[in-house]
């Protein structure tokens, strides 16, 4: 529990401290206070760097002091022989003695009290962006008129965030434009259009004047556009350095304007509008798109028709065409569907004949039926040659999809009859 | 076959053997057998065999047996109470529809049907081949296939021959243009047991082929002249019957 004051004594004080001890004390005063630690008695075996016996004062990771030997006060009106002032509310005191003492040493007596710290002046880093106000046990920040204190209770800024723009066209400017924008502010503007429309931002060079970058090229004040995982900027300087037309490919755009404490300029003004999301004209082999356009945008519907001999297979069913819609994400629906060569499948068997085994059963492939000669012949003509047609059928020039018919050859004996002379 | 020679089934791959009654037939396509009406009038479910030269029981077991689905007798064939006393063999033609198609090969293949043109009108002296397992000079039934080549003769030659064992007056026997008379040379003739077999004539338009000009029907006396059903006169009936009783697989 934090305390406002306390006493720390070496073991057995005021008797001699024992050999081989290590003891530590964790001092904690309330938040917002520092610690004043002072020693009124110090009698510890002296050694170089206090290597044998010592009392150590540690604040966080820093060693504030290491004491040994005998000390007496320099001031006859004060009993303090050594003192430490830390602007933190925690401190650790560690006492160590080694295995032997040449003489009898009585150790130390120390006291601590909680002291007020002036957060506004005692630290290198100023805690407030504008006005700092100290009080016992703490401080608070305050802001000039027109500014408000941010949630971090340290920084002041102007109220320039939270605007959401949903209209398909609009104009956005930095606070006070064309008067100088406020320092130390983060302005966030959100453009949220209907899905299927991309935000297009247009800026004129002369409508942009933001504190220039430092010598390392880092913008001190910056304008950034964020669309999903894509970022445009940061931009700064006199005259807009980016593209005058920014196609975000997104229906959602966040505009972030960040300023530091110094160097305010007139700021910026931009226009935006919503363009229907374009879909790229994809290369779909063996097909034609209807209607044919130079550019396709959100909600456009095309019929993709396969060329003769090609089909789109969906769920193991073949079709000659399919519809694709330009979606809100700039991608085509049914984009996985492709026109592939028609497969006529394994040719049917015929009675008393055979079909040569096809090397391929795809569009354009050719097969030949033959009859079991010399006992059968092809009755219905056509020559027996079939090709895989665009409709998925094996087709003959003469018979169409009708299969050849192998019928018996009649009236031909395998061996002629010879009368035996008697 | 009287006065014939031994033959091999490869000489007559269309030859069909009927075992009851002992007779013949001609295969005309995968599903149909052409025979004489008098062969099937008494047995509408005949057992038939193809592809074997010998009709020995052991050989038949290895040959192809044909199962009939239906027998179609020509509507002009007069059915009698006592077929043995028949004197009218007009329209002696029938078709047997098979249950299953016959697989063709060197020992089984059909004979052609005559065309309808005048090219297929027979002239006296035109030669035809007959084959069968019927009576020979030596035995009642042949075990191995016999065949003979004989000429077409004028119908009067058949009329002039005295019927050997008449069952009626000689004048009672009917002779019509639906019959072909053939034989009379070297005693070569068809006989009992050869009925229904083809009288095969060389196709006038394709010398490599034979067509069934006639079917062994009847005769006054074995070894003289014989009468054969004139198939040309029945081609329309044959085609119509086959068409009306075919399966889609044949169409």
């Amino acid at each position: 529990e934090p305390t406002m004051y306390g006493e720390i004594l070496s073991p057995n004080y005021p008797q001699a401290y024992p050999s081989e001890v290590e003891k530590s004390w964790d001092i904690e005063v309330p938040e917002g206070y520092g610690i004043h630690l002072y020693f009124t008695h110090l009698d510890i075996e002296l050694s170089e760097n206090c290597a044998y016996d010592s009392v150590q004062i540690i604040s966080g990771d820093t060693e504030e002091g290491r004491l040994c030997g005998q000390r007496s006060s320099n001031n006859p009106h004060s009993p303090i022989v050594e003192e430490f002032q830390v602007p933190y509310n925690k401190l650790q005191v560690i006492f160590k003695s080694d295995f032997s003492n040449e003489e009898r040493f009585t150790g130390f007596a120390a006291y601590y009290v909680a002291t007020d710290i002036n957060e506004c002046t005692d630290f290198v880093d100023v805690p407030c962006s504008h006005f700092c106000n100290n009080f016992i046990g703490g401080y608070f920040c305050s802001c000039p008129p027109e500014y408000f204190l941010h949630d971090d209770m340290k920084n002041c800024g102007v109220n320039c965030s939270g605007d959401v723009f949903t209209a398909l066209i609009g104009e956005i400017a930095s606070p006070n434009y064309p008067k100088p924008y406020p320092e130390n502010s983060r302005c966030e503007y959100q453009i949220r259009l209907e899905k299927g429309f991309q935000v297009v931002v247009t800026l004129r060079r002369e409508d942009f004047d933001v504190e220039a970058a430092d010598s390392a090229g880092n913008c001190l004040d910056s304008l950034v556009f964020v669309a999903g995982d894509r970022q445009f900027g940061p931009y700064c300087g006199h005259g807009f350095p980016g593209p005058l037309n920014i196609e975000t490919k997104s229906n959602a755009l966040d505009i972030i304007f960040q300023t530091d404490l110094t160097g305010q300029k007139k700021g910026w003004k931009l226009r935006y509008h919503g363009d229907p999301m374009p879909c790229p004209k994809e290369d779909t082999p063996n097909s034609v798109w209807e209607p044919a356009k130079a550019k396709y945008v959100f909600r456009d519907v095309v019929q993709i028709t396969c060329l003769d001999g090609f089909e789109v297979v969906e769920g193991r069913v073949g079709a000659t065409s399919f519809y694709s819609t330009c979606q809100s994400n700039g991608k085509w629906s049914n984009s996985k569907l492709k026109c592939q060569p028609v497969d006529c499948g394994i040719p049917e068997s015929i009675e008393n004949g055979k079909v040569e085994d096809p090397e391929s059963t795809l569009f354009g492939s050719v097969i030949r039926y033959t009859c079991e000669e010399p006992y059968y012949y092809m009755e219905n003509g056509g020559g027996g040659e079939y090709h895989c047609a665009g409709n998925g059928s094996w087709v003959n020039e003469v018979l169409g999809p009708e299969l050849p018919k192998c019928v018996p050859v009649c009236g031909v004996p395998r061996e002629p009859f010879e009368e035996k002379q008697r | 076959i009287i006065g014939g020679s031994d033959a091999d089934i490869k000489n007559f791959p269309w030859q069909v053997f009927f075992d009851n009654p002992w007779a013949g037939g001609a295969l005309i396509n995968e599903y149909w057998v052409l025979t004489a009406a008098h062969v099937v009038e008494g047995n509408r479910e005949p057992t038939m065999y193809v592809g074997s030269t010998s009709v020995q029981t052991s050989r038949l077991a290895k040959s192809k047996m044909l199962t009939p689905e239906h027998v179609f007798i020509h509507p002009g064939w007069k059915l009698l109470e006592v077929p043995e006393g028949r004197t009218n063999f007009d329209n002696d033609i029938a078709l047997v529809r098979l249950k299953d198609p016959v697989k063709m090969g060197p020992t089984v293949s059909p004979i052609c049907l005559p065309g309808t043109s005048s090219d297929y009108n027979l002239m006296d002296g035109d030669l035809g081949l007959i084959s069968g397992w019927g009576r020979t000079e030596k035995r009642d039934r042949a075990v191995r296939l016999k065949a003979a080549r004989l000429p077409v003769a004028p119908l009067r030659k058949c009329k002039e021959v005295k019927v050997e064992k008449p069952t009626a007056d000689a004048e009672a026997y009917v002779f019509t243009p639906n019959m072909i008379c053939a034989g009379g040379e070297k005693g070569m003739d068809s006989c009992k047991g050869d009925s229904g077999g083809a009288f095969a004539v060389q196709d006038p338009n394709d010398k490599t082929k034979f067509y069934a000009a006639g079917l062994v029907s009847w005769g006054p006396q074995c070894g003289t002249y014989g009468l054969y059903t004139r198939v040309k006169n029945y081609v329309d009936w044959i085609m119509k019957t086959m068409q009306e009783n075919s399966t889609p697989r044949e169409d």
């Epitope: 497969d343 068997s349 998925g392 | -």
Partner: antibody
Framework: EVMLVESGGGLVKPGGSLRLSCAAS????????MSWVRQAPGKGLEWVAT????????YELDSVDERFTISRDNSKDTLYLQMNSLRAEDTALYYC???????????WGQGTLVTVSS | QIVLTQSPATLSLSPGERATLSCTAS???????LHWYQQKPGKAPKLWIY???NLASGVPSRFSGSGSGTDYTLTISSLQPEDFATYYC??????????FGQGTKLEIK
């Protein structure tokens, strides 16, 4: 007479392999495309694979595509089904069938039983 | 893939009655490639009707088939004791897979 006789079935553990054979007779085997069809106990028919007459073109059911291979040896008038990585759901009576007009299966074997169980 | 649905799953009728078995395809099937099979317990299936309406060899004329597009029917005009069996419809489509219906069991009432 057309005859198809399957063999090679039996009991096999999951992950195991079997090779089914189908001996054909009574027709010119090399003239016909052939198929394997299976029937799980008490269930309906399920097509498994098809092979063209010469064996160059095959189609297999998606669920067995990587595991089963249909093949044929026309010199031996025999159809085969090599089954690897067998699963319990492959348990069935496997029939071979001849494909005829319009890919109707006009002749079937009597079937061979494959049981996949640990 | 084309799914074939047969109805009813079981049909209970008496000999002499008329039987109507239905097969419905999930998408249009060519009537040339729609076939029916008969299967009796413990036996292999037999091709019964091919290309929608053609009776296979040995199938009695009391059987008939009809249909087009997605709806197909097998009809038995007057049931005989030997007709009680399971009937499967089957379609072939070049893109595969070949599919069968789940079967209709025709049983004696």
């Amino acid at each position: 007479e057309v005859m198809l006789v399957e063999s090679g079935g039996g009991l096999v553990k999951p992950g195991g392999s079997l090779r089914l054979s189908c001996a054909a007779s009574g027709f010119t085997f090399s003239n016909y495309a052939m198929s394997w069809v299976r029937q799980a106990p008490g269930k309906g028919l399920e097509w498994v694979a098809t092979i063209s007459s010469g064996g160059s073109k095959t189609y297999e059911l998606d669920s067995v595509d990587e595991r089963f291979t249909i093949s044929r040896d026309n010199s031996k008038d025999t159809l085969y089904l090599q089954m690897n990585s067998l699963r319990a759901e492959d348990t069935a009576l496997y029939y071979c069938a001849r494909l005829f007009t319009k890919h109707a299966m006009d002749y079937w074997g009597q079937g061979t039983l494959v049981t996949v169980s640990s | 893939q084309i799914v074939l649905t047969q109805s009813p799953a079981t049909l209970s009728l008496s000999p002499g009655e008329r039987a109507t078995l239905s097969c419905t395809a999930s998408s249009s099937v060519s009537s040339s490639y729609l076939h029916w099979y008969q299967q009796k317990p413990g036996k292999a299936p037999k091709l019964w009707i091919y290309s929608t309406s053609n009776l296979a060899s040995g199938v009695p004329s009391r059987f008939s088939g009809s249909g087009s597009g997605t709806d197909y029917t097998l009809t038995i005009s007057s049931l005989q004791p030997e007709d009680f069996a399971t009937y499967y419809c089957h379609q072939y489509y070049r893109l595969h897979p070949i599919t069968f219906g789940q079967g209709t069991k025709l049983e004696i009432k």
